[in-house]
C-alpha cells in the first residue's frame, strides 16, 4: 500500500536521555521522541521497527507524516493521538504491521487534518464501530479521511470474536456516516466471503476500491449504482464464479470505471453466457483477454472472450423420479 512518502531531508535521532518523563508537557519544537527519527524540514517522524508498545506521547507538533510501523502496539486507545497542542497538521499516519489487535472508539480523534490512514497488516480482532467516527451519534462530524488502507487486517481464525469480521469492518466504515468523503478504500487480503449490501451506497465519494485477494464468491446482492464516481474496482484473486446481468448493467453504467477481474475461478457453463457477451462488448474490464475458465474441467484454461454460446452448456438436471439416491 502507498504510504506517506518522506523527502530526502536529513533525520535527527532522539538522544537516549529524552525520556517520556516530559510527555505531559507540550513538546519542545525540535524534540524527537526516543526511538524515533525526525525531520522537521520534511515534517516527518519515523518510529519504525522499534517494538514500541504505545504511541509516543511527545510527538513534535510539526509532524505531518507519521510512520509507526513494525511495532507492538496491541491496543490503540481513545485519543491515542490527542495532544495539547493538538497534532493539527498530521495528514498521513501509517500504523501498518504493528501488531494491533484492538482499535477503540475515538482512537483518531483530535486529528483535524488526517487525510490518509494505513492500518494494514494488523490482526484487528476488535475494531470499534466508532474507531473512525469517534462518537456513537447517528450522524458524526465528517472525518477528514480521504484514503483508508485496511489491507490484511483479518486476525487468525482462533483470535476472531464470535461475529462476522466483514460486519465488524463495515460497521466501522459506516458509523455516523463520518466517511462520506472517503475517496480511496483498500480492503485487500481480508478473507471476505461477502460484501454487506449497504456498504457501498454509504460511501458516495469513493474513487478507488480494492477488494482483491479476498474470498468473494458473488456480487449478486452488492449494488454499485450509487458509486457514480468510482474509477477503479479491484476484484482480482477472489472466488467469483460468474457476474450476473444486474451487476454487469450496474458496472457498465458507471461513467469512469475500470474493473479488474483477473484470477477468479470462473465457471463456464450456461450461466456464463451473459457475462461472456458483455465482456466482448465492454471496455470497462482491464485485461479481459486474460480471463479464463476454471470449471468445469473440460473448460479449464479456456479464454472467456473466445467462448460462444455453444460452449456454455449446463448438464441437464434429472427429474426427481429419475434420480438415484
Amino acid at each position: 500500500s502507498s504510504s506517506p512518502t518522506s523527502s530526502a531531508s536529513s533525520f535527527s535521532s532522539s538522544a537516549p536521555f529524552l525520556a517520556s518523563a516530559v510527555s505531559a508537557q507540550p513538546p519542545l519544537p525540535d524534540q524527537c521522541p526516543a526511538l524515533c527519527e525526525c525531520s522537521e524540514a520534511a515534517r516527518t517522524v519515523k518510529c519504525v521497527n522499534r517494538n514500541l508498545t504505545e504511541v509516543p506521547t511527545d510527538l513534535p507538533a510539526y509532524v505531518r507524516n507519521l510512520f509507526l510501523t513494525g511495532n507492538q502496539l496491541a491496543v490503540l486507545p481513545a485519543g491515542a493521538f490527542a495532544r495539547r497542542p493538538p497534532l493539527a497538521e498530521l495528514a498521513a499516519l501509517n500504523l501498518s504491521g504493528s501488531r494491533l489487535d484492538e482499535v477503540r472508539a475515538g482512537a483518531f480523534e483530535h486529528l483535524p487534518s488526517l487525510r490518509q490512514l494505513d492500518l494494514s497488516h494488523n490482526p484487528l480482532a476488535d475494531l470499534s464501530p466508532f474507531a473512525f467516527s469517534g462518537s456513537n451519534a447517528s450522524v458524526s462530524a465528517p472525518s477528514p479521511l480521504v484514503e483508508l488502507i485496511l489491507n490484511h487486517i483479518v486476525p487468525p481464525e482462533d483470535e476472531r470474536q464470535n461475529r462476522s469480521f466483514e460486519g465488524m469492518v463495515v460497521a466501522a466504515l459506516l458509523a455516523g456516516r463520518a466517511l462520506q468523503g472517503l475517496r480511496r478504500l483498500e480492503l485487500a487480503s481480508n478473507h471476505f466471503l461477502y460484501l454487506p449490501r449497504d456498504v457501498l451506497a454509504q460511501l458516495p465519494s469513493l474513487r478507488h476500491l480494492d477488494l482483491s485477494n479476498n474470498s468473494l464468491v458473488s456480487l449478486t446482492y452488492v449494488s454499485f449504482r450509487n458509486l457514480t464516481h468510482l474509477e477503479s474496482l479491484h476484484l482480482e484473486d477472489n472466488a467469483l464464479k460468474v457476474l450476473h446481468n444486474g451487476t454487469l448493467a450496474e458496472l457498465q453504467g458507471l461513467p469512469h470505471i475500470r474493473v479488474f477481474l483477473d484470477n477468479n475461478p470462473w465457471v463456464c457453463d450456461c450461466h456464463m453466457a451473459d457475462m461472456v457477451t458483455w465482456l466482448k462488448e465492454t471496455e470497462v474490464v482491464q485485461g479481459k483477454d486474460r480471463l479464463t475458465c476454471a470449471y468445469p474441467e473440460k473448460m479449464r484454461n479456456r479464454v472467456l472472450l473466445e467462448l460462444n454460446s455453444a460452449d456454455l452448456d449446463c448438464d441437464p438436471i434429472l427429474p426427481p423420479s429419475l434420480q438415484t439416491s
Epitope: S2, S3, P4, T5, A8, A91, A92, S113, R115, Q116, P142, P144, V146, E147, G181, R183, R184, S205, R207, H208, H229, E231, S232, H234, H256, R258, F260, Q286
Partner: antibody, heavy 120, light 107 residues
Framework: QVQLQQSDAELVRPGASVKMSCKVS????????IHWMKQRPEQGLEWIGY????????TYNEKFKGKATLTADKSSSTAYMQLNSLTSEDSAVYFC?????????????WGTGTTVTVSS | DIQMTQSPASLSASVGETVTITCRAS??????LAWYQQKQGKSPQLLVY???TLAEGVPSRFSGSYSGTQFSLNINSLQSEDFGIYYC?????????FGAGTKLDLK
C-alpha cells in the same frame, strides 16, 4: 528531489494530434496521481483530468472528454497526454502536476510545462 | 461545478506591506482549498493546502485562513520575490477548479 520533466514545445497544424510527456523522478511513480492543467496566454488555469499510474484509472473534466487522453507507463515513470483534433483554442501551456497523494487533489509539485501552438 | 471567485483581480503593494487575497467557493468545500503562486514564464508552486497548512519550504510570512466558504491568503511583510500571480483551487470534488487569479505587483 522530486521532478516532473515535460517534453518540448510543439507546433502543430489544425486538425492534427499531439502527445506530450511528463517524466517523473525522485519518488515512486505509482504512489501519486498525475494531474494535467491547461493555461492559455494571460489566462487562468483549467484542470483537464488525472490518472492514477498504479492501475491507469482516473477521470476527466467533462469539458476535455474526447479532447484529451491520459495514459501512464510504469516502466519509464512517464505520464502522457494526447490532444486530438487541435484548433487554435488548444494553443496553450500544458502542465502536469503531482497529487499530494493518490486522491488529495492538490498539486505539490508541477512540471516544467509544454507549450502547444496550433497554427497553419 | 464549484465556482471559485477570487478577489481582487489585481493588487499593487510595496515591499514590507501586508496583503490579503480572498477566494469564495460557490458551495461548501470544508477546508479543501489550496493556494498557488506563479511567476511570469514559470510553473505554479504550492503555497498552502487544506486551507491553512503551509507547503514544505514556504516562508511563514504566508498564512491561510477560512470561515465558511470564504478563504484568505495573507502575506505579511511582502518580499520582492512574492510578486506574481496567486491562484486558489478547491480540492473537494471533481472537476477541480481554480480562481481566476490575483496579480500582485510592485506599487
Amino acid at each position: 528531489q522530486v521532478q516532473l520533466q515535460q517534453s518540448d514545445a510543439e507546433l502543430v497544424r489544425p486538425g492534427a494530434s499531439v502527445k506530450m510527456s511528463c517524466k517523473v523522478s525522485g519518488y515512486t511513480f505509482t504512489d501519486h496521481t498525475i494531474h494535467w492543467m491547461k493555461q492559455r496566454p494571460e489566462q487562468g488555469l483549467e484542470w483537464i483530468g488525472y490518472i492514477y499510474p498504479r492501475d491507469g484509472s482516473g477521470t476527466y473534466n467533462e469539458k476535455f472528454k474526447g479532447k484529451a487522453t491520459l495514459t501512464a507507463d510504469k516502466s519509464s515513470s512517464t505520464a502522457y497526454m494526447q490532444l486530438n483534433s487541435l484548433t487554435s483554442e488548444d494553443s496553450a501551456v500544458y502542465f502536469c502536476a503531482r497529487d499530494g497523494s493518490s486522491h488529495y487533489w492538490y498539486f505539490d509539485v508541477w512540471g516544467t510545462g509544454t507549450t502547444v501552438t496550433v497554427s497553419s | 461545478d464549484i465556482q471559485m471567485t477570487q478577489s481582487p483581480a489585481s493588487l499593487s503593494a510595496s515591499v514590507g506591506e501586508t496583503v490579503t487575497i480572498t477566494c469564495r467557493a460557490s458551495e461548501i468545500i470544508y477546508n479543501y482549498l489550496a493556494w498557488y503562486q506563479q511567476k511570469q514564464g514559470k510553473s505554479p508552486q504550492l503555497l498552502v493546502y487544506n486551507a491553512k497548512t503551509l507547503a514544505e519550504g514556504v516562508p511563514s510570512r504566508f498564512s491561510g485562513s477560512y470561515s465558511g466558504t470564504q478563504f484568505s491568503l495573507n502575506i505579511n511583510s511582502l518580499q520582492s520575490e512574492d510578486f506574481g500571480i496567486y491562484y486558489c483551487q478547491h480540492h473537494h470534488d471533481t472537476p477541480l477548479t481554480f480562481g481566476a487569479g490575483t496579480k500582485l505587483d510592485l506599487k
